[in-house]
């Protein structure tokens, strides 16, 4: 499942890139899942992807911001855990999560991605595979 791990890691890098341009994002409050319950990570992930993060269209950073946002919304390679979670109906709806401005939104997204990487690594039976 290296492809899944790479994709999650890439998303973190894209979030870090966007954090550099947080002042050029529309200061809108967006649903930002935090302390996501076990088995609802993919549901929370889709909430982050659905959020309307937008460039404020100011200055010359608009293109890189828009490309970054577009890349964040791309569907990652699916995993068994992800497929199982898609059938859960008990996870909170996106609207039920606390809304936060872009800076906190991105920080919480990064935290979730890190948690998902950690879970993915923990589910591996041995640690000597190719990184």
């Amino acid at each position: 499942q290296d492809r899944h791990m790479i994709r999650m890691r890439q998303l973190i890098d894209i979030v870090d890139q966007l954090k550099n341009y947080v002042n050029d994002l529309v200061p809108e409050f967006l649903p930002a899942p935090e302390d996501v319950e076990t088995n609802c990570e993919w549901s929370a992930f889709s909430c982050f992807q659905k959020a309307q993060l937008k460039s404020a269209n100011t200055g010359n950073n608009e293109r890189i911001i828009n490309v970054s946002i577009k890349k964040l919304k791309r569907k990652p390679p699916s995993t068994n855990a992800g497929r199982r979670q898609k059938h859960r109906l008990t996870c909170p709806s996106c609207d039920s999560y606390e809304k936060k401005p872009p800076k906190e939104f991105l920080e919480r997204f990064k935290s979730l991605l890190q948690k998902m990487i950690h879970q993915h690594l923990s589910s591996r039976t041995h640690g000597s595979e190719d990184s």
Epitope: R3, M5, R9, Q10, D13, D16, K71, D130, S131
Partner: antibody, heavy 117, light 106 residues
């Protein structure tokens, strides 16, 4: 097996630009992003940035922003790193390194760039 | 930016010695730390990723530990081929390397 082969050594004058290439083989080029790292003589490693090999999306170390440009050519499985407005402090060995799942898992052999008047 | 500080910057040891290198991050990086080995005139090679996981082909005498801000690379029994410079690298926020630790023959 995975191989990253870089272009040869370069000598440049201050103010000039240099373009280093890194040709990948042994894996699907567009499946892995690529990092660039440099090392000044007798010094440590410094991360310069990375490029998405499938879409040319780049993330640069703020220190090099405005001076570095990373590109790729999917037809030849090659990535390029161009550094402009060279100064003596840019004398270093420049490495490409594959973006593995959690680490730089394979490295090129390095390209020495000497900036001297 | 996250700063990475390695200590010592150099050390002398003999074959068979147990060697410990430490790396400290300027802020919490969880387990997002890698270790690389570099020999003179060569490119770095990945040894350990995500704090403690051995990259394929790396001998089991190498091990890594730590979490948060303090990390350790241990070589349980130094071999002739282990004399080299070792770098830690964080990947919590983009990438930063430590200054390196040169392991020399005593």
């Amino acid at each position: 097996q995975v191989q990253l082969v870089q272009s040869g050594a370069e000598v440049k004058k201050p103010g000039a630009s240099v373009k280093v290439s890194c040709k990948a083989s042994g894996y699907t080029f567009t499946d892995y992003w690529m990092h660039w790292v440099r090392q000044a003589p007798g010094q440590g490693l410094e991360w310069m940035g990375l490029i998405d090999t499938s879409e040319s999306y780049t993330i640069y170390n703020q220190k090099f922003k405005g001076r570095v440009t990373m590109t790729r050519d999917t037809s030849t499985s090659t990535v390029y790193m161009e550094l402009s407005s060279l100064r003596s402090e840019d004398t270093a060995v420049y490495y490409c390194a594959r973006y593995g799942p959690l680490a730089m898992d394979y490295w090129g052999q390095g390209t020495l760039v000497t900036v001297s008047s | 930016d996250i700063q990475m500080t390695q200590s010592p910057s150099s050390l002398s040891a003999s074959v068979g010695d147990r060697v410990t290198i430490t790396c400290r991050a300027s802020q919490d990086i969880s387990n997002y730390l890698n270790w690389y080995q570099q020999k003179p005139g060569k490119a770095p090679k990945l040894l350990i990723y995500y704090t403690s996981r051995l990259h394929s082909g790396v001998p089991s005498r190498f091990s890594g530990s730590g979490s948060g801000t303090d990390f350790t690379l241990t070589i349980s029994s130094l071999q002739p081929e282990d004399f080299a410079t070792y770098y830690c690298q964080q990947f919590h926020t983009l990438r930063t390397f430590g200054g390196g630790t040169k392991v020399e023959i005593k």
